[in-house]
């Protein structure tokens, strides 16, 4: 058993049918010695008396808020949550496996640049009685500080007969050095509590691996005289690291017809302009990627040809 926060405790339960459970001793936080009784949640049934209460925690029915009283007055509370291990595996019931980039991916994180700021998000089908707490550091043995805000509900969507909720959190490395080579990964730890269930989820990554630039901005077309060709120009996104001479991007320019089946013409360039043939009813799209490290491509920025 360990303390998650004041008066909230997590019992780690290795569960299987007929498991003996965990013996837990609760101590009433009071100088009083006599006349103390214990109850669980809203029940008035007295579970025991004395300054300590020994319970056998076998299942969620044994978890909840234990309260010690004296003469009708509440002395202290202890909320017991369960962290369940089954077949040697800690439960992962609260969050949805996003399955990308691989199975058992519960947390996904992205950074728009090398500033040390990143966003993580996760999915759940649970709508109520749910809390998250996020901690982060660079490295784990001698951790360097990363400050995370509160997790917030960022999107709701319907998937089949299921409603899915997306939560996200923003974190910032306290002493980020954008140009430095990373040797220790960022660690992100999410504590999730649903009703009386505790679970924890972790992710470990280098900022360079989670970079996803914003789409190029100011995408413009300039028709070339007496030609079907146009000059496409764009700019680095505002959120990208500076100076651009050091933090350079490469670009993919795509001409796409109205029909998805039409052949796509693609040009790759390190410049912020390109000359392409603009077909009728087509659109031109540009996306960006770090020039020197193959992390994610940005989303597309698009303009119609007409």
């Amino acid at each position: 058993i360990w303390e998650l926060k004041k008066d909230v405790y997590v019992v780690e339960l290795d569960w299987y049918p007929d498991a003996p459970g965990e013996m837990v001793v609760l101590t009433c936080d009071t100088p009083e010695e006599d006349g103390i009784t214990w109850t669980l949640d809203q029940s008035s049934e007295v579970l025991g008396s004395g300054k300590t209460l020994t319970i056998q925690v076998k299942e969620f029915g044994d978890a909840g808020q234990y309260t010690c009283h004296k003469g009708g007055e509440v002395l202290s509370h202890s909320l017991l949550l369960l962290h369940k291990k089954e077949d040697g595996i800690w439960s992962t019931d609260i969050l949805k496996d996003q399955k990308e980039p691989k199975n058992k991916t519960f947390l996904r994180c992205e950074a728009k640049n090398y500033s040390g700021r990143f966003t993580c998000w996760w999915l759940t089908t649970i709508s109520t009685d749910l809390t998250f707490s996020v901690k982060s550091s660079r490295g784990s043995s001698d951790p360097q500080g990363v400050t995370c805000g509160a997790a917030t509900l960022s999107a709701e969507r319907v998937r089949g007969d299921n409603k899915e909720y997306e939560y996200s959190v923003e974190c910032q490395e306290d002493s980020a050095c954008p140009a430095a080579e990373e040797s220790l990964p960022i660690e992100v730890m999410v504590d999730a509590v649903h009703k009386l269930k505790y679970e924890n989820y972790t992710s470990s990554f280098f900022i360079r691996d989670i970079i996803k630039p914003d789409p190029p901005k100011n995408l413009q077309l300039k028709p070339l005289k007496n030609s079907r060709q146009v000059e496409v120009s764009w700019e680095y996104p505002d959120t990208w690291s500076t100076p651009h001479s050091y933090f350079s991007l490469t670009f993919c320019v795509q001409v796409q017809g109205k029909s998805k089946r039409e052949k796509k013409d693609r040009v790759f360039t390190d410049k912020t302009s390109a000359t392409v043939i603009c077909r009728k009813n087509a659109s031109i799209s540009v996306r960006a990627q770090d020039r020197y490290y193959s992390s994610s491509w940005s989303e597309w920025a698009s303009v119609p040809c007409s």
Partner: nanobody
Framework: EVQLVESGGGVVRAGESLRLSCAAS????????MGWFRQAPGTEREFVGS????????YYADSVKGRFTISRDNAKNTVYLQMSSLKPEDTAVYYC????????????????WGQGTQVTVSS
């Protein structure tokens, strides 16, 4: 929200078998841990057993262990209670329940309940 409807109850003789079904509609059935409870007249609702969302693990009350089996078919949104070697003391209204906590024998850990189906075991 999940709606639960039990079926399969009836009158049987001691030693016989019966299979109860619980059909779920509404939000995704496979998200929920499912439980069976029963209530005899004048008594509190009693835990019978439960099954986890994947159907890979079950948990039973001592009074039914070895005689009752819970299973589920997530494709059919249905949970089953196979009862064998029935005894007169198994007579009760049987309720199906859906919740988020497995294992739990406590009724308040379940969020959704069916209306119940009567099982009577005569001697």
């Amino acid at each position: 929200e999940v709606q639960l409807v039990e079926s399969g109850g009836g009158v049987v003789r001691a030693g016989e078998s019966l299979r109860l079904s619980c059909a779920a509609s509404g939000r995704s059935f496979s998200n929920y841990e499912m439980g069976w409870f029963r209530q005899a007249p004048g008594t509190e609702r009693e835990f019978v057993g439960s099954i986890n969302r994947r159907g890979s693990s079950t948990y039973y009350a001592d009074s039914v262990k070895g005689r009752f089996t819970i299973s589920r078919d997530n494709a059919k949104n249905t949970v089953y209670l196979q009862m064998s070697s029935l005894k007169p003391e198994d007579t009760a209204v049987y309720y199906c329940a859906a919740g988020w906590l497995y294992p739990s024998s406590r009724s308040r850990d379940y969020d959704y309940w069916g209306q119940g189906t009567q099982v009577t075991v005569s001697s």
